[in-house]
């Protein structure tokens, strides 16, 4: 008799792939543009990234530090009208991209939550949730919740409103905290909350703490669905040197949970390489003309256009990983088992029932190392085969699709491998 298939878990749309944050419409579109109508024209690009949701804004009216002049129900006219927003929603829906609206109230001001008028602001948020849910948004994001007094109880209330409308609606909270205990206390009081934090940004510029941070987090959160990012808003390049970007992309797409990226992460957008650009929201480099301030500052391989034409680029890697993440059961909701492989190496398996399985080996070291895969660390349900097929490497030069002997697996400096192998009874 064939073994019984394992029952599939309930999957919400945000479980099926990455979220893509566009916190600054003007920086994203560039060239003095930056409105909802223009963003609609970029939805095909988002489709090409295979992302499942767009985290947008904030785009509401907000006079810096003035609670009376902050209206969460009104779109700032600089970004467009309610009609523009409705049109964007419709277009996004047609392309199966969900829209999450950021309602962080005082986004232009000093304290995101007008600390002296918390109750007033909380009421405004409540009204806004109901209003925008009726308008058809798929979820909400609120950031800087470490500045919100009694954040846990407010989040629980907002979560009730969101889920009360539909189980298919999402609430994301963001915090600058990297403290695991603080993060856990926020999660404990809010069952389905998706939380973005600076937790992984403590992994160090060499990535030396990544493995322990990830495993600690997963052990602490148990079966709870998590999200993976390095911060609540900033670019990966704010935290990582160039040589770790590919490793982190591979890791974020293959850990159990929802990967969350900021616009530009897919091309390695780096504010430090663009003099005069703000660290938190540099201009998106669509092509070499996107940053005309300093002629020659932008080369083709830094842009969407240039990287789209290069199969070995960071953007091409992002697209491939995003595609795998959204269609393979083992990556969608599979079990996760980390195991020893050697100094500087982080290796883990993702597997679901009798589906194809995935082995990830990440070399955070700046040296070529043989991976001593300690299969004895793994449960019987997740045993390693003698060989696995190379699906992709973060570095060019390997023959993809070829079987690799796991006993003789050697990684280049800062190389990550994604390997696949079939279930064996």
């Amino acid at each position: 008799r064939a073994p019984r298939c394992r029952e599939l878990p309930a999957q919400k749309w945000w479980h099926t792939g990455a979220l893509y944050r566009i916190g600054d419409l003007q920086a994203f579109q560039g060239h003095g543009a930056g409105n909802l109508a223009g963003l609609k024209g970029r939805l095909d690009y988002l489709s090409s990234l295979k992302v499942k949701g767009l985290v947008l804004g904030p785009i509401h009216k907000n006079q810096k530090d003035d609670v009376a002049q902050t209206d969460l129900l009104q779109i700032d006219p600089n970004f467009g009208s309610k009609e523009d927003f409705d049109s964007l929603l419709q277009s996004a829906k047609k392309k199966s991209i969900r829209v999450i609206l950021d309602l962080t109230p005082n986004y232009r001001g000093e304290n995101s939550w007008f600390s002296t008028q918390v109750d007033t602001v909380a009421t405004k948020v409540k009204d806004a949730l109901e209003f925008w849910l009726q308008a058809g948004v798929d979820g909400f994001q609120v950031r800087d919740i470490e500045n919100l007094k009694d954040a846990s109880s407010f989040l629980a209330e907002w979560q009730n409103i969101t889920k009360g409308f539909s189980e298919d609606r999402l609430l994301i909270a963001g915090t600058n905290s990297s403290d695991l205990q603080q993060i856990l206390s926020l999660l404990e009081s809010n069952k389905d909350l998706l939380l973005t934090s600076s937790y992984l940004s403590d992994s160090g510029s060499t990535g030396e703490h990544t493995k322990s941070l990830v495993t600690q987090y997963l052990n602490a959160t148990g079966n709870r669905w998590c999200s993976w990012s390095l911060s609540q808003a900033r670019l990966l390049t704010s935290f990582l040197p160039a040589q770790l970007l590919r490793l982190y992309q591979l890791m974020l797409f293959t850990l159990p949970g929802t990967p969350v990226f900021s616009y530009g992460d897919e091309i390695g957008l780096d504010a430090a390489a663009l003099p005069g650009q703000p660290m938190e929201a540099p201009v998106m480099l669509w092509d070499e003309s996107s940053f005309p301030d300093i002629p020659g500052a932008v080369s083709a391989n830094m842009t969407v256009k240039g990287q789209s034409e290069d199969p070995g680029s960071l953007l091409s890697l992002f697209r491939r990983l995003s595609d795998q993440r959204s269609k393979e059961r083992s990556l969608l909701h599979g079990d996760f088992h980390a195991f020893s492989a050697g100094p500087g190496l982080f290796s883990y398996i993702r597997h679901w029932d009798q589906n194809e399985r995935f082995l990830v080996v990440l070399n955070f070291g700046d040296v070529g190392l043989s991976a001593g895969l300690q299969a004895s660390d793994l449960p019987a349900s997740a045993s390693l085969p003698a060989k696995a097929d190379l699906l992709l490497s973060t570095q060019p030069g390997r023959e993809e699709g070829s079987p690799l002997e796991l006993e003789r697996l050697k990684l280049e400096p800062h190389e990550g491998l994604l390997l696949r192998f079939p279930y064996a009874a």
């Epitope: 160090g204 060499t206 990535g207 030396e208 493995k211 322990s212 160039a242 040589q243 020893s340 492989a341 050697g342 100094p343 500087g344 190496l345 955070f364 070291g365 700046d366 040296v367 070529g368 190392l369 043989s370 570095q395 050697k410 280049e412 400096p413 800062h414």
Partner: antibody, heavy 119, light 113 residues
Framework: QVQLQQPGAELVRPGASVKLSCKAS????????MNWVRQRPGQGLEWIGL????????HYNQMFKDRATLTVDKSSSTAYMQLSSLTSADPAVYYC????????????WGQGTTLTVSS | DIVMTQSPSSLAMSVGQKVTMSCKSS????????????LAWYQQKPGQSPKLLVY???TRESGVPDRFIGSGSGTDFTLTINTVQAEDLADYFC?????????FGGGTKLEIK
């Protein structure tokens, strides 16, 4: 300042084992890799292996894989190398050497332990 | 394993002269991703442990006098000592730090005339 302290000498019998120590001070022990290198009389340098003190993950030169065992004691910031089945080919100066996380070059070295194998 | 070959095995120079020594690797030490060459140079004075001089082929370790200059790429590397001093009497070893097992050259012994 960074220091790696090793005993000056060890005398052991052929076929026996020896456990060499390397006490680190002046830096965060768990933030750097510890390597072991040997130098036989009048010869060059041979890399034996490395250990990451943060999680005790090890990596060995295949030539020493079956005979060398690297360990650490985080509480005393001490690294150890045990070498078993000693023969007349093993007398050498054994150095511990620090490397930044993920790097393969060695920025600080101990003074070395002179190992003598004699019956 | 990557084999490292140094030449000459020894050389004698007078104080103030310029010294060059060579190191060759059996395969390229250039990482095409970051365009760095993974080669280090060490100095070992008599009765002492080795001391790091240069890594990534040309990056001088802090505190090392600027008369020590590392150069080269791919498989061919050179350590140059401009205006050699009496205290430079030592053995000099190159080492590849590209890939495990890390391997050293046989050394060049510098004697002062």
């Amino acid at each position: 300042q960074v220091q790696l302290q090793q005993p000056g000498a060890e005398l052991v019998r052929p076929g026996a084992s020896v456990k060499l120590s390397c006490k680190a001070s002046g830096y965060t022990f768990t933030s750097y890799w510890m390597n072991w290198v040997r130098q036989r009389p009048g010869q060059g340098l041979e890399w034996i292996g490395l250990i990451d003190p943060s999680d005790s993950e090890t990596h060995y030169n295949q030539m020493f894989k079956d005979r060398a065992t690297l360990t650490v004691d985080k509480s005393s910031s001490t690294a150890y190398m045990q070498l078993s089945s000693l023969t007349s080919a093993d007398p050498a100066v054994y150095y511990c050497a620090r490397a930044s996380y993920g790097k393969g070059y060695f920025d600080y070295w101990g003074q070395g332990t002179t190992l003598t194998v004699s019956s | 394993d990557i084999v490292m070959t140094q030449s000459p095995s020894s050389l004698a120079m007078s104080v103030g002269q310029k010294v060059t020594m060579s190191c060759k690797s059996s395969q390229s030490l250039l990482n095409n991703i970051n365009q760095k060459n993974y080669l280090a140079w060490y100095q070992q004075k008599p009765g002492q442990s080795p001391k790091l001089l240069v890594y990534f082929a040309s990056t001088r370790e802090s505190g090392v006098p600027d008369r020590f200059i590392g150069s080269g790429s791919g498989t061919d590397f050179t350590l140059t000592i401009n205006t050699v001093q009496a205290e430079d009497l030592a053995d000099y070893f190159c080492q590849q730090h590209y890939s495990s097992p890390f391997t050293f050259g046989g050394g060049t012994k510098l004697e002062i005339k």
